[in-house]
């Protein structure tokens, strides 16, 4: 079945942008001017998820790349990774659970909770130039709030 998708950039609540750091990692840092062109453009898709009143299930792919953010156990810890997929089959309505994030949107601030690991969120560090990761705490030092901006192609 076809899915609704959009192209966007994400910034954390400290206005740090997300950029590629090597082939399979994202990092967050402050960008200005022409450097803004470095930021990753996501293809966010509306996918199937579990019933909820305030959570909207989405998948986060990298635009025009066959890479999706996914959540897996590594050394017994929920971990965020970029995973290659077959572009002929993605995005799809019924994404595997590791690719699904529950988008929680309050006052134009977005959180992305892992569907595979409830209460684990896409997170950034306070520090500059650090990897984007899956964090198990909300409201602590790490940042779990993002803003989204559409990207015109």
């Amino acid at each position: 079945a076809p899915v609704r998708s959009l192209n966007c950039t994400l910034r954390d609540s400290q206005q740090k942008s997300l950029v590629m750091s090597g082939p399979y990692e994202l990092k967050a840092l402050h960008l200005q001017g022409q450097d803004m062109e470095q930021q990753v453009v996501f293809s966010m898709s509306f996918v199937q998820g579990e019933e909820s009143n305030d959570k909207i299930p989405v998948a986060l792919g990298l635009k025009e790349k066959n890479l999706y953010l996914s959540c897996v156990l590594k050394d017994d810890k929920p971990t965020l990774q970029l995973e290659s997929v077959d572009p002929k089959n993605y995005p799809k309505k019924k994404m595997e659970k590791r690719f699904v994030f529950n988008k929680i949107e309050i006052n134009n601030k977005l959180e992305f909770e892992s569907a595979q690991f409830p209460n684990w969120y896409i997170s950034t560090s306070q520090a500059e130039n650090m990897p984007v990761f899956l964090g198990g705490t909300k409201g602590g030092q790490d940042i779990t709030d993002f803003t989204m901006q559409f990207v015109s192609s």
């Epitope: 079945a1 076809p2 899915v3 609704r4 998708s5 959009l6 192209n7 966007c8 966010m44 509306f46 019933e51 909820s52 009143n53 305030d54 909207i56 989405v58 309505k93 988008k103 949107e105 134009n108 977005l110 803003t147 989204m148 901006q149 559409f150 990207v151 015109s152 192609s153």
Partner: antibody
Amino acid sequence: EVQLVESGGGLVQPGGSLRLSCTVSGFSLSSYAMSWVRQAPGKGLEWVGIIYDSASTYYASWAKGRFTISKDTSKNTVYLQMNSLRAEDTAVYYCARERAIFSGDFDYWGQGTLVTVSS
Amino acid sequence: EIVMTQSPSTLSASVGDRVIITCQASQSIDNWLSWYQQKPGKAPKLLIYRASTLASGVPSRFSGSGSGAEFTLTISSLQPDDFATYYCQNTGGGVSIAFGQGTKLTVL
């Protein structure tokens, strides 16, 4: 305060074209999706389509090909281009804001603009 | 495409009555359903989303329930301001969004 104001409606002949505008204030089109919904006189609501970014638009099956949604974020305006108009396109056309991305429901609506297709 | 069917099409009731409007989807839509109220000459107003969550500023006499393909809107004690037309809406069916045909609530 969130506001949506439609304009551009009026009388048009069958086969003609019309472009409706929806100017918004109190929020940014760079973070909210916008939809068009129409209502024929004395009839129910009918979804036309929705726009996220300029490249991501989705339409009701009956609207594909004849109707096009676009936007100019710098002008805070969303457009509905309607071509090859027919008598059955006569309706009040509303623009509406999607409450949250992919929520599919609409929390703010304009007052509507009437389009009459008649010779 | 998913088709939404409301019943009844028209409903007469009195102030203080408990009113139930039903909406059926042609296939399962989980809880991706909203309800709107519309008064003549006015734009629709969002009442309920995700089948049961009350929208901001909506009185608590309105409630929604259901999941899958069967949904209900209940007004626990009808007030004079509630006479209007009510629409259900499928909000999560693939790329398309669809409204029911409406239920007109009139004074008995």
